[in-house]
C-alpha cells in the first residue's frame, strides 16, 4: 500500500468561452481508495478555489459554469490525489479560456446539386454555426472546413471555406453518392468534430470539370449570383 501516483491534467476545453471543463488522468492508486480534488487560483490573485462541479464533465473532471469562467484571466490549477498513505499533486497547468475553445460542430448542413441552364453544374452547400456560439458579440471568428468523398472512396477531399457559411464545388464524379461534412474552429482554439454526414447523389449527367476550371467557374458563379442579388 502506497501513496497515490502523480495525476496529470491533460485537457481543458470550452465550447464557447462561457464555460469550460478540464480532465485529469489519475496516477496509480497505491492499492487504496483515492480522493481527487482540483484546486486553482486566477493569476493576479492568491485566494485558492476548489472545483465547483466534479459531475458534469464525467469521471476525473472539473466543470466551470458561467459564474466560474472569466475571460482574459489565466487559471492556475492542480489536482491533488489523496489516500490513507499520503498525497500527490499534479504539475500546475495554466489555462486561458481564449485558447481552449473547441466548438460543437456546425449545424443544419444542407447540400444541393445546382444545374443552371447557362453554366456548368455545381454542388452547393450551406450550414449554420453551432448554437452555443454567439457571433454577434464579436468575440468569435469561426473558420470552416468542408470534406467530401464518394461513398465508397477511402480518401476525403478537403476544402477550406474561411468564415463563409456556404460553399460551392464544381469537380465531382457524375453518378456517385457523396458524403459531405463540415467542421469549424475559432481563430484561437481547436477544430470541432465533423458534423454528421449529409449524403447527396450526383446525377449521371453532371458535367465533370477539371480542377483548373474549378476556380474560374466558382468565380463566375459567385459573380453571377452577386449580380442577380443586386439587380
Amino acid at each position: 500500500q502506497l501513496p497515490p501516483g502523480k495525476p496529470e491534467i491533460f485537457k481543458c476545453r470550452s465550447p464557447n468561452k462561457e464555460t469550460f471543463t478540464c480532465w485529469w488522468r489519475p496516477g496509480t492508486d497505491g492499492g487504496l481508495p483515492t480522493n481527487y480534488s482540483l484546486t486553482y487560483h486566477r493569476e493576479g490573485e492568491t485566494l485558492m478555489h476548489e472545483c465547483p462541479d466534479y459531475i458534469t464533465g464525467g469521471p476525473n473532471s472539473c466543470h466551470f459554469g458561467k459564474q466560474y469562467t472569466s475571460m482574459w484571466r489565466t487559471y492556475v490549477m492542480m489536482v491533488n490525489a489523496t489516500n490513507q498513505m499520503g498525497s500527490s499533486f499534479s504539475d500546475e497547468l495554466y489555462v486561458d479560456v481564449t485558447y481552449i475553445v473547441q466548438p460543437d460542430p456546425p449545424l443544419e448542413l444542407t447540400v444541393e446539386v445546382k444545374q443552371p441552364e447557362d453554366r456548368k453544374p455545381y454542388l452547393w452547400m450551406k450550414w449554420s454555426p453551432p448554437t452555443l456560439i454567439d457571433l454577434k458579440t464579436g468575440w468569435f471568428t469561426l473558420l470552416y472546413e468542408i470534406r467530401l468523398k464518394p461513398e465508397k472512396a477511402a480518401e476525403w477531399e478537403t476544402h477550406f471555406a474561411g468564415q463563409q457559411t456556404e460553399f460551392k464545388i464544381l469537380s465531382l464524379h457524375p453518378g456517385q453518392k457523396y458524403l459531405v461534412q463540415v467542421r469549424c474552429k475559432p481563430d484561437h482554439g481547436y477544430w470541432s468534430a465533423w458534423s454528421p454526414a449529409t449524403f447527396i447523389q450526383i446525377p449521371s449527367d453532371f458535367i465533370m470539370n477539371d480542377g483548373l476550371n474549378d476556380i474560374f467557374e466558382a468565380q463566375k458563379i459567385e459573380w453571377h449570383e452577386h449580380h442577380h442579388h443586386h439587380h
Epitope: G44, H49, E50, Q67, Y68
Partner: antibody, heavy 118, light 106 residues
Framework: EVQLVESGGGLVQPGGSLRLSCAAS????????MNWVRQAPGKGLEWVAY????????YYADSVKGRFTISRDNSKNTLYLQMNSLRAEDTAVYYC???????????WGQGTLVTVSS | DIQMTQSPSSLSASVGDRVTITCRAS?????LHWYQQKPGKAPKLWIY???KLASGVPSRFSGSGSGNDYTLTISSLQPEDFATYYC?????????FGQGTKVEIK
C-alpha cells in the same frame, strides 16, 4: 429563492465553546464556497473563515486561527462554525455568506448573536 | 495581508448631493467589491468586480478604480442611501474589509 439561516448563537462564558450552523436552501450548496463573517456591536465587518465547495481549501482570519473550525456537510446543505476557547472579543453577530463564482458574499443570512461574557 | 483603508469614515450630506467614498488597498487588486449595510440589518452586496451593480441597485450608484485606488460614487443622494458602505477585497487571503463609511443626513 436563496436562503441562509444561522442558528446556535447565545451567551457563553470565556473559554467556553459554541457551534454555529447555517442551513442553506434555494441553490446547489455543494457548488459554492461558503464563509463566516462577523460584526462586533457598533463595529465594522470582519471576515472569519472560508471553506471551498468540497472542503479542500479552508482559510481562517488570524484572530480565530487554532480556535475556530469551519466545516460543511453537503448532504445536509449545512455550514458549521465550531468555536472553542471563546474570548470577550469574539462577541459579535455571525453571518453565513456564500461566494458566487468570484463574487464574494452575494447572499447573507440574518445573523446569529454570540455573546461571550462571565 | 492586504489592508483596506476607507475615507472618509463618516460624512454628512443632503438629499441630491453627489457623494464619493474612496478605498485604498495596501496591495494592487484586480477587483474590489462594495457592501451597503443599514442599522440592524445584514449587509448587502452593492457593487462587485469594481463597477458592476448588484441586482436591484439604482443606477445613481457607480464604482470605479484600479490597482490600489477605488471609489464608490452616488450621483444624487436619496433618503434610502443613508447607510454604511464597506469596501472589500476577495483576491487574497486573508479576505479584508475596509473599516466602513457612514453616510449620514446633514
Amino acid at each position: 429563492e436563496v436562503q441562509l439561516v444561522e442558528s446556535g448563537g447565545g451567551l457563553v462564558q470565556p473559554g467556553g465553546s459554541l457551534r454555529l450552523s447555517c442551513a442553506a436552501s434555494g441553490f446547489t450548496f455543494s457548488s459554492f464556497g461558503m464563509n463566516w463573517v462577523r460584526q462586533a456591536p457598533g463595529k465594522g465587518l470582519e471576515w472569519v473563515a472560508y471553506i471551498s465547495s468540497g472542503s479542500s481549501i479552508i482559510y481562517y482570519a488570524d484572530s480565530v486561527k487554532g480556535r475556530f473550525t469551519i466545516s460543511r456537510d453537503n448532504s445536509k446543505n449545512t455550514l458549521y462554525l465550531q468555536m472553542n476557547s471563546l474570548r470577550a472579543e469574539d462577541t459579535a453577530v455571525y453571518y453565513c455568506t456564500r461566494f458566487y463564482g468570484y463574487i464574494p458574499f452575494d447572499y447573507w443570512g440574518q445573523g446569529t448573536l454570540v455573546t461571550v461574557s462571565s | 495581508d492586504i489592508q483596506m483603508t476607507q475615507s472618509p469614515s463618516s460624512l454628512s450630506a443632503s438629499v441630491g448631493d453627489r457623494v464619493t467614498i474612496t478605498c485604498r488597498a495596501s496591495s494592487s487588486l484586480i477587483y474590489l467589491h462594495w457592501y451597503q449595510q443599514k442599522p440592524g440589518k445584514a449587509p448587502k452586496l452593492w457593487i462587485y468586480d469594481t463597477s458592476k451593480l448588484a441586482s436591484g441597485v439604482p443606477s445613481r450608484f457607480s464604482g470605479s478604480g484600479s490597482g490600489n485606488d477605488y471609489t464608490l460614487t452616488i450621483s444624487s443622494l436619496q433618503p434610502e442611501d443613508f447607510a454604511t458602505y464597506y469596501c472589500f477585497q476577495g483576491s487574497g487571503y486573508p479576505l479584508t474589509f475596509g473599516q466602513g463609511t457612514k453616510v449620514e443626513i446633514k
